[in-house]
């Protein structure tokens, strides 16, 4: 008789999850010489240990500490790019501008990007059928706690000018409930971070509005200013052209004519 299994509202663990994490770890450590010392089997064991046999609504940041320790990585603190609701463009950007880093350009972010996982209380099984949904089931689920933990650490490491890419096509350009709004903003360290610069990415070809005047951006400015960090905002009217100009800054079509 099959054992009764909790039905959650969210999708189950990504198929071939253990193999995917292990393969990503091997690939990342091969590409990044500074992480060659990492033992990927130990990384997988620590990752697994964070959620296997635990109730998937009762995961804590503490559960992920062994994984955090193994994945400790130094990125240039003044080259950090945060993003909210515009992951693809942020990743395209750091692929072009190789000295800047999103969270997913670090080992731990790379391992978990776009994956889902959860276990079951008191069994060593991975649940491939369903996992808790943040809204409908519980917030202390394995995936949400992981991203909260790594996002907090990433923000805490930032210094000087920190950049954030925001989606200007959304009704809330800055969303207090996003990972950026609820975790990263509050974990930037005022003694290290001088300025947060927002890049508001426009969606429409002919959209020349100043989205830096949007009420949600003003709300972000207020939160940041209260934390004694300066705030700056730029409209990226043409993200396609912007990427092209980042790739080739000498291109005359990027530059105003005298």
């Amino acid at each position: 008789v099959p054992r009764w299994r909790q039905q959650w509202s969210g999708p189950g663990t990504t198929k071939r999850f253990p193999e995917t994490v292990l393969a990503r770890c091997v690939k990342y450590t091969e590409i990044h010489p500074e992480m060659r010392h990492v033992d990927c089997q130990s990384v997988w064991d620590a990752f697994k240990g964070a959620f296997i046999s635990k109730h998937p609504c009762n995961i804590t940041e503490e559960d992920y500490q062994p994984l955090m320790k193994l994945g400790t990585q130094t990125v240039p603190c003044n080259k950090i790019l945060l993003w909210s609701r515009i992951k693809d463009l942020a990743h395209q950007f750091t692929q072009v501008q190789r000295d800047m880093f999103t969270l997913e350009d670090t080992l731990l972010g790379y391992l978990a990007d776009d994956l889902t996982w959860c276990g079951e209380f008191n069994t060593s099984k991975i649940n491939y059928q369903s996992c808790p949904d943040w809204r409908k089931d519980c917030s202390n689920n394995p995936v949400s706690v992981f991203w909260k933990t790594v996002s907090r650490r990433f923000a805490e490491a930032a210094c000087d000018v920190v950049h954030v890419m925001l989606n200007g096509s959304r009704s809330k350009i800055f969303d207090k409930n996003s990972t950026f709004g609820s975790v990263e903003v509050h974990n930037l360290q005022p003694e290290k971070v001088q300025t947060l610069e927002a890049w508001v990415i426009h969606g429409g070809r002919e959209d020349s509005r100043d989205l830096c005047q949007d009420p949600t951006i003003k709300e972000l400015e207020s939160i940041i200013s209260k934390r004694n960090i300066q705030f700056s905002c730029k409209n990226i009217y043409r993200p396609d052209k912007f990427l092209q100009c980042v790739k080739n800054p000498e291109d005359s079509s990027c530059t105003s004519e005298i």
């Epitope: 501008q97 800047m100 000018v161 950049h163 300025t195 610069e197 020349s208 100043d210 830096c212 700056s232 905002c233 730029k234 409209n235 990226i236 009217y237 043409r238 052209k241 912007f242 100009c245 980042v246 800054p249 000498e250 079509s253 990027c254 530059t255 105003s256």
Partner: nanobody, 118 residues
């Protein structure tokens, strides 16, 4: 807005020299073509000199042969050496990215006042 801090302006007699400096913090300034702009009273802001991240320069006809733009990428600093100054050079001088405003919007610093007396 502290990401662009211009300095070096002042009062100088016609024929004199000044060297303006601009410290620019933030990614867009570090890789983009940078420009020195000026705005005289009652006139529109105009671009007078540009320098690409690779060091290629361009000048407005009115300043050619008198002004020299340079940059120190390691220090995120852009300079404008102004020689043989004329009264018509009197303006507030600003530095900023010279990328087209149809691509990226500009946020301005407070500029530095240059006054040339005859």
């Amino acid at each position: 807005q502290v990401q662009l801090v211009e300095s070096g302006g002042g009062l100088v007699q016609a024929g004199g020299s000044l060297r303006l400096s601009c410290v620019a913090s933030g990614f867009i300034y570090s890789i983009s073509t940078m420009g020195w702009y000026r705005q005289a009273p009652g006139k529109q802001r105009e671009l007078v000199a540009t320098i690409t991240s690779g060091g290629n320069t361009n000048y407005a006809d009115s300043v050619k042969g008198r002004f020299t733009i340079s940059r120190d990428n390691a220090q995120n600093t852009v300079y404008l050496q102004m020689n043989n100054l004329k009264p018509e050079d009197t303006a507030i001088y600003y530095c900023n990215t010279a990328w087209r405003e149809t691509i990226v919007s500009r946020v301005w610093g407070q500029g530095t006042q240059v006054t040339v007396s005859s």
